[in-house]
């Protein structure tokens, strides 16, 4: 914490300007009025403060706003945003996309993924849902940021907005996030023709259930190996050799390259070796001919 001193009369601050860069930390603490700072935040980013000086300014704002900064201040934080922790940001209520854009620009090139994720979360909470304008802002200013949101937050995306999401925006999404987004995409794209539908739904397929993958295998989609490898293990395991062959089409040869990686490895272990042999790829590890495998881990009959 900055040591408290009295401000010398000649150093009293009446406006936020460049003269402040010559103030020592102690002088800034003593002479800058927090309310004045908050009122003139729009000037701060144009002044080349050192990181140490920015620490003092942040301290002043923290004292003035212990419950979290108002959006009028947040909007003009500029490089002061780089000093914020996720805990600080969690106190904010942000509704303006201009504020979001400004802070996303500042964060570019800095290791601030936790802060950015928290900021986006606050915006979604503040706006009530992840609407089209918010998604458009994220995809434009922060590709991949969509996946920083929790499944709970993503559940507020209306299906009508899904069309604005690009494949690269989903690259870092995990299975739990795709579980939320996939059914929305399935609803959003359901009126498209088969080939157009597959192009649109492909980035979301990591959240698809087995029956949807089986249905795709009947539609000559020729799924690429990268997409196949992102399918849920649980969605792939029930597929037959014939279904996988139909699903992948000419890309089926890629199974050999991925033979040791999940979900291909796990799928191979569930297939009869003579069925695998029909692919002519030399895949090994299937159930030997004549063996009967009883899976007691799941109480189910084949349906």
């Amino acid at each position: 914490d900055v040591e408290r001193t009295t401000c010398p009369p000649e150093k009293e601050v009446h406006e936020i300007d460049e003269s402040l860069i010559f103030y020592k930390k102690r002088e800034l603490e003593a002479c800058v009025d927090a309310a004045l700072l908050a009122a003139q935040m729009d000037r701060v980013d144009a002044i080349p403060f050192t990181y140490e000086q920015l620490d003092v300014l942040k301290h002043k704002l923290d004292e003035l706003y212990p419950q979290g900064y108002p959006e009028s201040v947040i909007r003009h934080l500029g490089h002061l945003f780089l000093k914020m922790s996720p805990e600080d940001i969690r106190k904010w209520n942000v509704t303006s996309l201009e504020t979001l854009k400004a802070l996303l620009k500042v964060s570019k090139g800095h290791e601030m993924s936790a802060q950015v994720a928290t900021l986006i979360d606050r915006v979604v909470v503040g706006r009530g849902q992840l609407d089209k304008d918010t998604v458009d802002t994220l995809t434009a200013f922060c590709p991949g940021c969509l996946c920083s949101l929790s499944p709970e937050r993503l559940s507020s995306v209306p299906p009508s907005v899904i069309g604005a999401v690009r494949p690269q925006d989903l690259d870092t999404c995990g299975p739990r996030q795709l579980d939320v987004l996939y059914p929305k995409a399935r609803l959003a794209f359901q009126n498209m023709s088969g080939s157009e539908y597959f192009v649109k739904i492909r980035p979301f397929l990591g959240g698809a259930p087995t029956e949807d993958v089986k249905a795709l295998s009947q539609q000559n989609v020729s799924m690429d190996l990268a997409t196949f490898m992102k399918l849920r293990r649980e969605a792939v395991l029930p597929l037959t050799v014939a279904e996988v062959q139909k699903l992948l089409g000419p890309h089926v040869e890629g199974l050999k390259v991925e033979e040791q990686h999940s979900p291909v490895r796990d799928w191979i272990l569930k297939q009869r070796q003579d069925d695998l042999d029909t692919l002519g790829l030399g895949l090994q590890g299937g159930i030997p001919n004549g063996y009967l495998i009883l899976d007691l881990s799941v109480r189910e009959a084949l349906s």
Epitope: R176, D179, Q190, G207, D212
Partner: antibody, heavy 122, light 107 residues
Framework: QVQLQESGPGLVKPSETLSLTCTVS????????WSWVRQPPGKGLEWIGY???????NSNPSLKSRVIISVDTSKNQFSLKLSSVTAADTAVYYC????????????????WGRGTLVTVSS | EIVMTQSPATLSVSPGERATLSCRAS??????LAWYQQKPGQAPRLLIY???TRATGIPARFSGSGSGTEFTLTISSLQSEDFAVYYC?????????FGQGTRLEIK
């Protein structure tokens, strides 16, 4: 042949929580989406919400604040909890399977349980 | 939410005759509409999806038509087992919504 069976108390007191379970037999719960639908006596059908085996859910905004749908893959079951019930929640509650095929890409139901009547009364 | 309205509320038709049931959506649902049949004390049974595609095992006398906001379920020659309540359901958007039902009774 996949079958669905609802189970739970037939009588719930006002302001309490209604709890129902649907057991899926003859197939894996992992392959589809599963829904709850209810029907008040002599009235139409109302979709409550669905769940995926991973736990991902979506529910009717009119009930969202009171609804929790959960899944237990080890038991091949999914459950409904509806809190703060009133007489208006008296209905036959059905669990149902969403058809789940991209070929017909739709959120409609090709398999239903027999339904269980839940009465809300003190 | 999309409101589905069915008409008439009750339809009286003689066995062997044709029955025509209507369903209207408050906004376009494209062809994302299903029809169900429900008999007393039973769960609904899927008849039609995609507005016009018969579900597995449904007799050819059941047919569906329409798109956008106006839909029709036609039963060409009524059998005794067809007298029941029929519901339409849209799946163009969440929440999924059903019509209030049309009761088809013997005249």
């Amino acid at each position: 042949q996949v079958q669905l069976q609802e189970s739970g108390p037939g009588l719930v007191k006002p302001s309490e929580t209604l709890s129902l379970t649907c057991t899926v037999s003859g197939g894996s719960i992992q392959n589809y989406y599963w829904s709850w639908v209810r029907q008040p006596p002599g009235k139409g059908l109302e979709w409550i919400g669905y769940i995926f085996y991973s736990g991902s859910t979506n529910s009717n905004p009119s009930l969202k604040s009171r609804v929790i749908i959960s899944v237990d893959t080890s038991k091949n079951q999914f459950s409904l909890k509806l809190s703060s019930v009133t007489a208006a929640d008296t209905a036959v509650y059905y669990c149902a399977r969403e058809v789940g095929r991209i070929a017909v890409a739709g959120w409609f139901f090709d398999l239903w349980g027999r339904g269980t009547l839940v009465t809300v009364s003190s | 939410e999309i409101v589905m309205t069915q008409s008439p509320a009750t339809l009286s038709v003689s066995p062997g005759e044709r029955a025509t049931l209507s369903c209207r959506a408050s906004q376009s649902v494209n062809a994302n509409l299903a029809w169900y049949q429900q008999k007393p004390g039973q769960a609904p049974r899927l008849l039609i999806y995609g507005a016009s595609t018969r579900a597995t095992g449904i007799p050819a006398r059941f047919s569906g038509s329409g798109s956008g906001t106006e839909f029709t379920l036609t039963i060409s020659s009524l059998q005794s087992e067809d007298f029941a309540v029929y519901y339409c359901q849209q799946y163009n958007n969440w929440p999924l919504t059903f019509g209030q039902g049309t009761r088809l009774e013997i005249k």
